[in-house]
């Protein structure tokens, strides 16, 4: 098989990548972004990194290969760079910026259910608690139907 | 108490590479919840971020300086250094080394060195 | 690059005066944004981070507000030791600083 992928030119804001074999089929660019703590994810089409949902949880990237159909595979313009996870879940802190499925909910800190101190004290102070600290997994109990029953009869 | 302090030769010749360290004293550079950075200030003149290196070894840089930096860490020594290449009077300022992380600052400089003046000329 | 304007580039105050500086992303940065205090000779010194929080040890006349693009740094009742220049600085993409307000005496 001969050829090569174009050059991937086209990245979105923050996207690196560095491809030291060359585009020809089965090369591998490496996948990183320009800030600290940012993680290079697939999002889809029509979603851009403002637009992300706290539920959706996008799949983490680390290369992208040309095909035999020369391709780049992922497609360089569906792979985005977002801040990545700090590494404080679980430890009693509602941290905004873990809040969201990507981080597994900061590891249950952000729902009184499910934070072991059974307060939700965020990160940082000025985080709202009806807004980035509210407590947003589906999972927790606040968010069961037996409660929202509760909830409604309160 | 965390101490930051800067070191290097006060005068630089045109074209040459300027190099700097930082020894941090009070806390261990290892750890992984901090980013270490290098800041300028020309005379007069405002702040200017140079680029920062994680614990790993991770490098982050000002777009505008990137092609002439290199910042590397030396966990052993608790030391990270500065290094900029092709070096003019207008790399003349005071230079400072601060430490940034999400905790407790949300990646605010909370720690800094007092500062060491670097002028280039010939 | 996200750029970052402050305003004013200074400002005549005295003693008492309640003093607001203002500083304006380029674009939204959520609350990624410190500000720090800087005495001539000295290095700056951190007086609020995520944009409201106050850092430890900081006098809490000094307090931080706005998040998104508009941020604003407030000293209630000024004192002879908070004349200095005021930066703000954001971390929502790389590092980038302000062009600095400098307080004076009137």
């Known amino acids: 098989m001969q050829g090569q992928c174009s050059v991937p030119n086209e990245l979105n804001s923050n996207l690196k990548l560095q491809c030291p074999d060359g585009y020809a089929i089965g090369s591998e660019c490496a996948t990183s972004c320009l800030d600290h703590n940012s993680e290079s994810i697939i999002l889809p089409m029509n979603v851009t990194v403002r637009d992300i949902p706290h539920w959706l949880n996008p799949t983490r990237v680390e290369r992208v290969v040309c095909t035999a159909g020369l391709k780049w595979y992922p497609h360089p313009a569906l792979i985005h760079c977002v801040k990545g996870c700090e590494p404080f879940m679980g430890d009693n802190y509602c941290d905004a910026i873990n809040n969201r499925a990507f981080c597994n909910y900061d590891g249950g800190d952000c729902c009184t259910s499910t934070v072991k101190t059974k307060k939700v004290t965020p990160f940082p102070m000025s985080c709202d608690l009806q807004g980035d600290c509210a407590c947003r997994d589906p999972q927790a109990q606040e968010h069961s139907r037996k409660d929202l029953r509760g909830y409604s009869h309160g | 108490q965390l101490q930051l302090q800067e070191s290097g030769p006060g005068l630089v010749k045109p074209s040459e590479t300027l190099s700097l360290t930082c020894t941090v004293s009070?806390?261990?550079?290892?750890?992984?919840?901090?980013?270490w950075g290098w800041i300028r200030q020309p005379p007069g003149k405002g702040l200017e971020w140079i680029g920062s290196?994680?614990?790993?070894?991770?490098?982050y840089f000002n777009p505008s300086l990137k092609s002439r930096v290199t910042i590397s860490v030396d966990t052993s020594k608790n030391q990270f250094s500065l290094k900029l290449s092709s070096v003019t009077a207008a790399d003349t300022a005071v230079y400072y080394c601060?430490?940034?992380?999400?905790?407790?600052?949300?990646?605010?400089?909370?720690?800094w060195g007092q500062g060491t003046t670097v002028t280039v000329s010939s | 690059d996200i750029q970052l304007t402050q305003s004013p580039s200074s400002v005549s105050a005295s003693v008492g005066d309640r003093v607001t500086i203002t500083c304006r992303a380029s674009?939204?940065?959520?609350?990624?944004l410190a500000w720090y205090q800087q005495k001539p000779g000295k290095a700056p010194k951190l007086l609020i981070y995520?944009?409201?929080s106050l850092q430890s040890g900081v006098p809490s006349r000094f307090s931080g507000s706005g998040s998104g693009t508009d941020f604003t740094l407030t000293i209630s009742s000024l004192q002879p030791e908070d004349f200095a220049t005021y930066y703000c600085?954001?971390?929502?993409?790389?590092?980038?600083f302000g062009g600095g307000t400098k307080v004076e005496i009137k």
């Open positions: 601060a430490r940034s992380g999400y905790r407790p600052s949300f990646y605010a400089m909370d720690a």
């Open positions: 009070g806390g261990s550079i290892s750890s992984s919840s901090y980013n």
């Open positions: 290196i994680s614990s790993s070894g991770s490098t």
């Open positions: 674009q939204d940065i959520s609350y990624w």
């Open positions: 995520a944009a409201s």
């Open positions: 600085q954001q971390a929502y993409l790389l590092h980038t």
